[in-house]
């Protein structure tokens, strides 16, 4: 399962697309900044095993995919870029799922992993709640776009786990 290279490449492509998706100047959205509390401390302080890294990354990408697959998201972004971005995420999910199948049989601690997955879900719940409170305004989406780009680049510890031989 040659995940590190393919994942890094797809991740980079997704980030480039996300960067291109902006429709309004972010300079007009400064007052809409919000603390989403990405669980970086939990991630940074943990040495992820390969299977753990795969399942947490899968959850992050799945939640991002869900967020950008809503009707509200379709109204906010340029359609062709949104489709390309969603396709890139979908391919990443497929890659991760294929790797999970290959990694079956490797021991992991499911409960500990569930904690990380729950932290990711709560993080995306906070993002969804923020968008709802802001009535899915263009600036709210800009703030969320910046936050997702940041969280993608924060998941470096998870990517280190992908390179680890269990």
């Amino acid at each position: 399962c040659d995940l590190p290279q393919t994942h890094s490449l797809r991740n980079r492509r997704a980030l480039i697309l996300l960067a291109q998706m902006g429709r309004i100047s972010p300079f007009s959205c400064l007052k809409d900044r919000h603390e989403f509390r990405f669980p970086e401390e939990e991630f940074d302080g943990h040495q992820f095993q390969k299977t753990q890294a795969i399942s947490v990354l899968h959850e992050m990408i799945q939640q991002t995919f869900n967020l950008f697959s809503t009707e509200d998201s379709s109204a906010a972004w340029e359609q062709s870029l949104l489709e390309k971005f969603s396709t890139e995420l979908y391919q990443q999910l497929n890659d991760l799922e294929a790797c999970v199948i290959q990694e079956v049989g490797v021991e992991e601690t499911p409960l500990m992993n569930e904690d990380f997955i729950l932290a990711v879900r709560k993080y995306f719940q906070r993002i969804t709640l923020y968008l709802m409170e802001k009535k899915y305004s263009p600036c709210a989406w800009e703030v969320v776009r910046a936050e997702i780009m940041r969280s993608f680049s924060f998941s470096t510890n998870l990517k280190k786990g992908l390179r680890r031989k269990d």
Epitope: A19, G22, S25, P26, F27, S28, C29, L30, K31, D32, R33, H34, E35, F36, E142, V143, A146, E147, M149, R150, S153
Partner: antibody, heavy 121, light 107 residues
């Protein structure tokens, strides 16, 4: 280690042009905006403007709009501040500083060492 | 533009004193306020961001509070290295604006 390194001090005559630089290292240059701040001798801090190096989008303070131009070259992780025609009143220390954009993170957490610009006939 | 007014413009204090600097915004800026310290010939240094968050590496004797239009920077026990000029800056909207500064001098 995050660093913003600015170009050296400049002595110019009124009417001359000038471009000073700010080179970022130790972080993803396109993930942060770069702001410019002026400090005239013995005075306080004045925000001049800001650039998003990822797409070179800029915003200026009304006081500096049309007086200076902010640009960036992301391929060499460098932001610039330029004047087409300097005035004696442009004599000041100029600082660059990084800004997290729309992210909830510390504003202007790293600063350049400053570039002293002296304009005198 | 949002105007930022600091008070006092200067103060004299002794080592060990508790020092309070206030900053008032001309309109509500929620908690979008930063505090910086500047020493002569040096670049400003971020102390507090978003009104009350202590920047990494800054001593815990520095604290910030406030929301809306009124904000405070407190140095609980002034140290020799704290004699400097302090600036507040609103981070709510462009154009970003700074207070005029408060110079903390040795009594």
């Amino acid at each position: 280690e995050v660093q913003l390194v600015q170009s050296g001090a400049e002595v110019k005559k009124p009417g001359e042009s000038l471009k000073i630089s700010c080179k970022g290292s130790g972080y993803s240059f396109t993930s942060y905006w770069i702001g410019w701040v002026r400090q005239m001798p013995g005075k306080g801090l004045e925000w001049m403007g800001i650039i998003d190096p990822s797409d070179s989008d800029t915003a200026y303070s009304p006081s500096f709009q049309g007086q200076v131009t902010i640009s960036a070259d992301k391929s060499i992780s460098t932001a610039y501040l330029q004047w087409s025609s300097l005035k004696a009143s442009d004599t000041a220390m100029y600082y660059c500083a990084r800004h997290p954009g729309l992210n909830w993170a510390p504003d202007f957490d790293y600063w350049g060492q400053g570039t002293l610009v002296t304009v005198s006939s | 533009d949002i105007q930022m007014t600091q008070s006092p413009s200067s103060l004299s204090a002794s080592v060990g004193d508790r020092v309070t600097i206030t900053c008032r915004a001309s309109q509500s800026i929620d908690g979008a306020l930063n505090w910086y310290q500047q020493k002569p010939g040096k670049a400003p240094k971020l102390l507090i961001y978003f009104a009350s968050s202590l920047q990494s590496g800054v001593p815990s004797r520095f604290s910030g509070s406030g929301s809306g239009t009124d904000f405070t920077l407190t140095i609980s026990s002034l140290q020799p290295e704290d004699f400097a000029t302090y600036y507040c800056q609103q981070a709510y909207d462009f154009p970003l604006t700074f207070g005029q500064g408060t110079k903390v001098e040795i009594k």
